[in-house]
């Protein structure tokens, strides 16, 4: 399998609303027209797929309607946003990029972005 370098930030802190954004950048060895991006979560040595999108170069990423991910693409960069995160979702989020067409097929897997999610403190009861 032809390998491709994928870069992503080491650490990202989710917002108080449970939203985390990071850039996934790949070093495209060829002129891909169709690219698949998959976000994987690794926690306790288990890897699960968070979301995936296939896009045509120059077009927007389209995730499934019920996906917790959204994203935009610009050249060889994909800006990914994951929403609805809670403290229990803290973990390593790995960006996997596949150049689907034209051949040859290339696969690149990033080292992962550690996303920290802190649940907001509930507002204290007020007498006012």
């Amino acid at each position: 399998c032809k390998a491709m370098h994928v870069a992503q930030p080491a650490v990202v802190l989710a917002s108080s609303r449970g939203i985390a954004s990071f850039v996934c950048e790949y070093a495209s060895p060829g002129k891909a027209t169709e690219v698949r991006v998959t976000v994987l979560r690794q926690a306790d040595s288990q890897v699960t797929e968070v979301c995936a999108a296939t896009y045509m170069m120059g077009n927007e990423l389209t995730f499934l309607d019920d996906s917790i991910c959204t994203g935009t693409s610009s050249g060889n960069q994909v800006n990914l946003t994951i929403q609805g995160l809670r403290a229990m979702d803290t973990g390593l989020y790995i960006c996997k990029v596949e150049l689907m067409y034209p051949p040859p097929y290339y696969l690149g897997i990033g080292n992962g972005t550690q996303i920290y999610v802190i649940d907001p403190e509930p507002c204290p009861d007020s007498d006012f």
Epitope: C1, K2, K31, T33, E34, T54, M56, E98, M100, Y101, P102, P103, P104, Y105, L107
Partner: antibody
């Protein structure tokens, strides 16, 4: 010359699996994706997916995900398409087709096709 | 997913006639369209790729045109061996869908 030769016709019972082979010759086997296309009696052609002979990577149409497995054996220049949990509406001719990509036109197509394998699913 | 609609579904024509088949995509696909010919009991044969590029070995009486959503396959002078079913296929994005086919019959 460049050709794709497929395995013979199959008759299967509902719920069974079938594995169709496609042997390539006359070109660099690992330089082209191999696609699978099916055609039910009197119906349009339906793209099922591709396998990359070089890496073994696959890309399946959503309709077939979970039911189809495409593999390859580079030692004998052969790709395989296995369809599981067969139903009567899987009765069709299954074709393998070589991917053709024109770098100047930046467009793909299927330039070489196998002769087709008829799969009949009947109880 | 992108869908393709061909028209007409069938056409009756005589040898020497000019035949035109159209293919409409449900969304823009640039020039990423191919045309195939299929005869009964046989595998399809590639005629045109990239909307208008003639595949090697295909007679020049076949031509393709169009871009975006509307495409045309033209047979300038129908020959006896051209009676068959013709399919368009979008190769813009997966899944690579085919049209429903146009059958060219002898009048």
């Amino acid at each position: 010359q460049v050709q794709l030769v497929q395995s013979g016709a199959e008759v299967k019972k509902p719920g069974a699996s079938v594995k169709v082979s496609c042997k390539a010759s006359g070109y660099a086997f690992d330089g082209h994706y191999m696609h699978w296309v099916r055609q039910a009696p009197g119906q349009r052609l339906e793209w099922m997916g591709w396998v990359d002979p070089h890496s073994g990577a696959t890309n399946y149409a959503q309709n077939f995900q979970g039911g189809v497995t495409m593999t390859r054996d580079t030692s004998i220049n052969t790709v395989y398409m296995e369809l599981s949990s067969l139903k009567s509406d899987d009765t069709a001719v299954y074709y393998c087709a070589r991917d053709f990509y024109d770098t100047s036109a930046k467009s793909g197509a299927f330039d070489i096709w196998g002769q087709g394998t008829m799969v009949t699913v009947s109880s | 997913a992108i869908q393709l609609t061909q028209s007409p579904s069938s056409v009756s024509a005589s040898v020497g006639d000019r035949v035109t088949i159209t293919c409409r995509a449900s969304q823009g696909i640039s020039s990423w369209l191919a045309w195939y010919q299929q005869k009964p009991g046989k595998a399809p044969k590639l005629l045109i790729y990239a909307a208008s590029s003639l595949q090697s070995g295909v007679p020049s009486r076949f031509s393709g045109s169009g871009s975006g959503t509307d495409f045309t396959l033209t047979i300038s002078s129908l020959q006896p061996e051209d009676f068959a079913t013709y399919y368009c296929q979008q190769v813009n994005s997966f899944p690579w869908a085919f049209g429903q086919g146009t059958k060219v019959e002898i009048k």
